[in-house]
């Protein structure tokens, strides 16, 4: 946020940039939280735009019985590993095909025991305030589907009729990690010492980090003809004086006619 300065007064302005503002030769360059010629004003809204998507990662282990383990499978650059990865990925894409949040799988390790496959199932959803519920539901469906396939696709007489067969007892969910996004926490942090006065309000499922000085929200402070200004003690209305009236009161709603004051009379609207 920048305010340009022209003329002789600029040199004085340079030394007066407030709130961590820096002089760039023309103007005060203000930190995110401030604006104004001297960075003296506190912004009324902070961009905490959520990520477009939120991700989750499930650490799973399955045991593949239709492939015999060889040492080459430990080497991720070997042809054996690459072919295994291709088949395993295709198989898992089929298993999870009905889950809109499913992105893919990532094999982390192959080890002996038929072939024990340590892998991550990757999930992603568009950000909405309900993203946690969406991803929680998706992880439950992943568990159901992998349990089902590893129970159904099994070897019979040492032969597999499916793309891959599994050991029913070898399926485990180790860990589930969901990318954390907390707009309230982000808002508080970014508002720094004004954190107590900034709140998150939603519009079209998007979070906005605003102070009561931002118009158009349920917490907005109506200063009438005055100007809302944030201070360390909270939002305050700075009342204006017109040619005919002085305005006062917490929300600048009390108008005093100048002519009546000069005539030693008070009149409130």
């Amino acid at each position: 946020r920048t305010t340009t300065c022209f003329g002789d007064g600029c040199q004085n302005t340079a030394s007066r940039c407030k709130n961590g503002g820096t002089w760039d030769g023309l103007k005060c360059q203000c930190p995110n939280l401030y604006y104004g010629e001297l960075c003296e004003e506190v912004v009324s809204s902070i961009d905490i735009g959520p990520p477009e998507t939120i991700s989750a990662q499930m650490e799973l282990t399955v045991t593949v019985t239709s492939v015999k383990f060889t040492e080459e499978l430990k080497n991720h650059s070997s042809q054996e590993f690459q072919e295994f990865k291709q088949t395993f990925t295709e198989q898992m894409n089929i298993v999870y095909s009905g889950i809109p949040e499913y992105v893919g799988v990532n094999i982390t390790k192959l080890r002996l025991g038929s072939v024990v496959v340590e892998h991550d199932v990757l999930l992603r959803t568009k950000y909405t305030p309900e993203y946690k519920t969406v991803l929680d539901n998706a992880t439950e469906v992943v568990k159901e589907k992998i349990t089902k396939v590893t129970t159904q696709q099994i070897m019979i007489n040492d032969i597999c009729s499916d793309m891959m067969c599994f050991n029913t007892t070898g399926t485990q969910v180790q860990n589930i990690t969901v990318t954390q996004y907390d707009p309230e926490e982000d808002c508080r942090k970014m508002a720094k010492e004004y954190g107590d006065y900034f709140v998150v309000e939603y519009r079209d499922q998007k979070p906005y980090c605003i102070s009561p000085c931002e118009p158009g929200f349920s917490v907005s402070k109506n200063c009438n003809l005055g100007k809302c200004q944030m201070s360390l003690s909270g939002p305050q209305c700075l009342c204006v004086t017109t040619e005919t009236h002085w305005y006062s009161g917490e929300t600048c709603n009390q108008g005093t006619q100048k002519s009546l004051v000069y005539g030693h009379h008070h009149h409130h609207h």
Epitope: V67, K68, T87, D158, D162, M164, C165
Partner: nanobody
């Protein structure tokens, strides 16, 4: 990349014999799994005979005792000896390979394929 080229197909009378060959390029012939699959018109591709580098072999019930799978590592060649051929053996025969030691009949698990050779059993 493994390349497979089949040969030996043709027309034969019921009860006759054919020997299919599959020549492989690349240095992977001595490891992994090799097999013969077939696909008759209007039907799905099915496993006929499979062999793995650990000595495991498989034959479809319909060919047991009539077909024999073998390989010559020095020539990088896979064979399918087919005896006592029947009309129902008519199909396109495909050679397949994988560097993995497989135990699956499902064609989707096999990574490398030849172009196929036609076998017709007819009187």
């Amino acid at each position: 990349e493994v390349q497979l080229v089949e040969s030996g197909g043709g027309v034969v009378q019921p009860g006759g014999s054919l020997r299919l060959s599959c020549a492989a390029s690349g240095d992977t012939f001595s490891r992994g799994s090799w097999g013969w699959f077939r696909q008759a018109p209007g039907k799905e591709r099915e496993a006929v005979a499979l062999i793995s580098s650990d000595g495991w072999t498989f034959y479809a019930d319909s060919v047991k005792g009539r077909f024999t799978i073998s390989q010559d590592n020095s020539k990088n060649t896979l064979y399918l000896q087919m005896n006592s051929l029947r009309a129902e053996d008519t199909a396109v025969y495909y050679c397949a390979a994988s560097v993995l030691v497989l135990r699956t009949l499902n064609p989707k698990a096999w990574h490398h394929w030849g172009q196929g050779t036609m076998v017709t059993v007819s009187s």
